[in-house]
Amino acid sequence: EDELQVIQPEKSVSVAAGESATLRCAMTSLIPVGPIMWFRGAGAGRELIYNQKEGHFPRVTTVSELTKRNNLDFSISISNITPADAGTYYCVKFRKGSPDDVEFKSGAGTELSVRAKPS
């Protein structure tokens, strides 16, 4: 059978400061079991952008409803974009672990660039 793929269809997205940025991500399968998280950057210093289970992310909303059954769309929208939000965003699937979840597969990343707010 085909192994799960993490699809981030846009290599780059450009948004004007003050607007919202939609970062798209889709999975090709519901399994393996485990959460999906969004990060900015890669490696040990990456910044957690969204994790549904824990944390407070007031600027982030999910594109699909949190109550949608068997959802494969893990796109997010980030509001009130500023130049500090520029960077490459990764959608990452984790495999459920005990006690800790293990990174399973990452999307290719979407580079967010921020344009100056139109005058």
Epitope: P32, Q52, K53, L66, K96, S98
Partner: antibody, heavy 119, light 108 residues
Framework: VQLVESGGGVVRPGESLRLSCAAS????????MTWVRQAPGEGLEWVST??????YYADSVKGRFTISRDNSKNTLYLQMNSLRAEDTAVYYC???????????????WGLGTLVTVSS | EIVLTQSPATLSVSPGERATFSCRAS??????LAWYQQRPGQAPRLLIY???IRETGIPERFSGSGSGTEFTLTITSLQSEDFAVYYC??????????FGGGTKVEIK
Amino acid sequence: VQLVESGGGVVRPGESLRLSCAASGFRFSNFAMTWVRQAPGEGLEWVSTIGSGDTYYADSVKGRFTISRDNSKNTLYLQMNSLRAEDTAVYYCAKDSTVSWSGDFFDYWGLGTLVTVSS
Amino acid sequence: EIVLTQSPATLSVSPGERATFSCRASQNVKNDLAWYQQRPGQAPRLLIYAARIRETGIPERFSGSGSGTEFTLTITSLQSEDFAVYYCQQYYDWPPFTFGGGTKVEIK
């Protein structure tokens, strides 16, 4: 959706048994699957879950039970070794369902198969 | 492990009346809670998921509410087929998935 368990029966302590669950009516390979058991007159107890090779077990069965699946046959298995009297229960096969970014619950259940462990 | 405590263990209700029973979690499970009905001699049946969403085909007289650690299942105007055992299940933190001990709804 239909789930049909088989393989239950009467065995002595220390013996083995293999349960099967034949699934139909959905794309079996896309979903995690679970075994839940119910001792006579008691409540429900989660036993084991399998995703796509990722497996999870209750502490009470870890090291004795093995969950597996054959996606080409749309069949879920539970190999039960070193059986104990306290394993006596009706064993239900269940299909996992997820809510968006969250965990799993069980939207379809088989009718169950009775396993009796007695000397 | 998250422990789910259901109360009461048994609820005696007359047909046509309302039944309300609770499920308390030992720690916050957000909305990651499901309710199941099990009639005598039958397999469990999913009623509610995400604490409040009715499964397809479940009558409107069943409703779930609550979040965090306190949850309630309400059945308005009990029908004869509603006399059964009801279990809650959390899927916020696992393994293990955990179930409550059940509430038996019997005819008064």
